[in-house]
């Protein structure tokens, strides 16, 4: 019971996991302009992975897409890997742990298999988290190199008297969710593994049956005969992990004009 | 069509205060409106803005001690309340709506503030 | 605050005429997110409220006659008028629509001559 419990919220809190990394990586909160001690403007600047956006305090809003592959920052290219990875690795560890679940009957599949499936998926879940993490992470370390050094620089001198202010960004939304996805799908792979240890067959073991011919009473003694399942007790748990992606095209909003925000 | 309609022409004495509204209509009360101040024979000045669907409001610093901005949403009504009138306060006030570029497309027809004693 | 400077104070031209409208702002108002340069031009006749003409920098605002046209990038805009016609008589003021607080120039009022 308790080897079902953990592996059906294992399963829950990486579905969970999942669905916020895939939320995380289609946001477009990464990074938002930072109005803390900065000129403050009637435009509000914030980015994705996958397109830029500004809005006005009029309410319009408009995003544009990153129509160029080559002209991106590396950092940026590695995060979105990171992502889709994540995001792919994760999917196909709920497909797998889906057929994995005790509860679900299908056919005539042996423990032993859904043990293996479990571990895999948990392996797959742990990888996905790890991917997440990784991608946010080296995401907010941009973030930080790039703001302080846009501090050190923040007034750039434009001919003469002239002035013109470096907008700074800071950790969007995007960022947070991703880190708690990528550490729930984390646990929920790691639950997913332990889980796996319950699920695989006790070895036991038959004596031998003794017949005693001279008497007319047989003693049968139940023993250890011992089956080989693949799961032996010393078998150790593997580990896996995942990440996300998306397009997004060129989205206008538009205020009406007889219709303020 | 979109209408900002402003209260009447206000004669008051120094010291006092004084509120103005501004009632729009033909459109959702939901964006920033704005106050503009012309003294006669100037140019333009921004006091403020407020935000109808939250009531957040952001204030010129010049004018942040003495202005109040306040609405009504029931009668799509926002109000600027200016205390302390001193003669240089002699002015036009304008309210405006936003709209694109954050530019002011819809204006009210001004109300007109006197100062004096 | 953005001090927005505009010249000349004042001109005359004769009816037909180009004319040009300069606008200086004291930091750029290009906004790097969208590319678009947060500067709108207002007329205003006497006795009556500014109307918007160009907000953008550049984007004609529906109902006015493409006769005016802006332009400028940065810190420095210009609104022509390609052919001055007599109902075109009234101040022109410039705005800074990006920072805090919103400034406009101090006018340029048109004449005919």
């Known amino acids: 019971m308790a080897v079902t419990a953990c592996q059906g919220l294992g399963f829950v809190v990486s579905l969970i996991g999942i669905a916020g990394i895939i939320a995380a990586t289609c946001m477009d909160q990464w990074s938002t302009q930072d109005l803390y001690n900065n000129p403050v403007t009637a435009v509000f600047n914030y980015q994705g992975l996958w397109r830029s956006c500004v809005r006005e305090s009029s309410g319009f809003t408009e995003c544009r897409g990153y129509f160029t592959l080559l002209g991106l920052p590396a950092m940026l290219q590695a995060v979105r890997a990171l992502m889709i990875v994540g995001i792919v690795l994760g999917a196909i560890g709920l497909l797998v742990s889906i057929f994995a679940l005790k509860c679900i009957r299908i056919g005539s599949m042996e423990d032993s298999a859904k043990a293996n499936m479990t571990l895999t998926s948990g392996i797959m879940f742990i990888v996905s988290g790890l991917c997440a993490i990784a991608g946010v992470s080296v995401f907010a370390n941009m973030l930080v190199t790039n703001f302080w050094m846009s501090t050190a620089n923040m007034y750039t001198g434009m001919g003469g008297m002239v002035q013109t202010v470096q907008t700074r960004y800071t950790f969007g939304a995007a960022l947070f969710v991703g880190w708690v996805a990528g550490g729930l799908t984390l646990i929920g792979g790691v639950m997913m593994c332990i889980a796996c240890r319950g699920l695989a067959p006790e070895e036991t073991n038959y004596k031998a049956v003794s017949y005693h011919a001279s008497g007319h009473s047989v003693a049968y003694k139940p023993g250890g005969f011992k089956a080989s399942t693949g799961f032996g007790s010393n078998t150790k748990n593997k580990k896996i992990y995942d990440g996300g992606a998306r397009t997004e095209d060129e989205v206008q909003s538009y205020p009406s004009k007889h219709d303020y925000v | 069509q979109v209408q900002l309609v402003q209260s009447g022409a206000e004669v008051v004495k120094p010291g006092a205060s004084v509120k103005l509204s501004c009632k729009a209509s033909g459109y959702t009360f939901t964006n920033w409106v704005h106050w503009v101040i012309q003294a006669p024979g100037q140019g333009l000045e921004w006091i403020g803005e407020?935000?109808?669907?939250?009531?957040?409001?952001n204030y010129n610093e010049k004018f942040k001690k003495r202005v109040t901005l306040t609405l009504d949403r029931s009668t799509s009504t926002v109000y600027m309340e200016l205390s302390s009138l001193r003669s240089e306060d002699t002015a036009v006030y304008f309210c405006?709506?936003?709209?694109?570029?954050?530019?002011?497309?819809?204006w009210g027809q001004g109300t007109l503030v006197t100062v004096s004693s | 605050d953005i001090v927005m400077t505009q010249s000349p104070d004042s001109l005359a031209v004769s009816l037909g005429e180009r004319v040009t409208l300069n606008c200086k702002s004291s930091?750029?108002?290009?906004?790097?997110?969208?590319?678009?340069?947060?500067l709108t031009w207002y007329q205003q006749k006497p006795g009556q409220p500014p109307k918007l003409l160009i907000y953008w920098s550049s984007t004609r605002e529906s109902g006015v006659p493409d006769r005016f046209s802006g332009s400028g990038s940065g810190t420095d805009f210009t609104l022509t008028i390609s052919s001055v016609q007599a109902e075109d008589v009234a101040v022109y003021h410039c705005?800074?629509?990006?920072?805090?607080?919103?400034?406009f120039g101090g006018g340029t009022k048109l004449e005919i001559k």
């Open positions: 930091q750029s108002l290009l906004n790097a997110g969208n590319q678009k340069n947060y």
């Open positions: 705005q800074n629509n990006y920072y805090y607080p919103l400034t």
């Open positions: 405006a709506g936003i709209y694109y570029g954050n530019s002011f497309a819809h």
């Open positions: 407020i935000n109808p669907t939250n009531a957040r409001s």
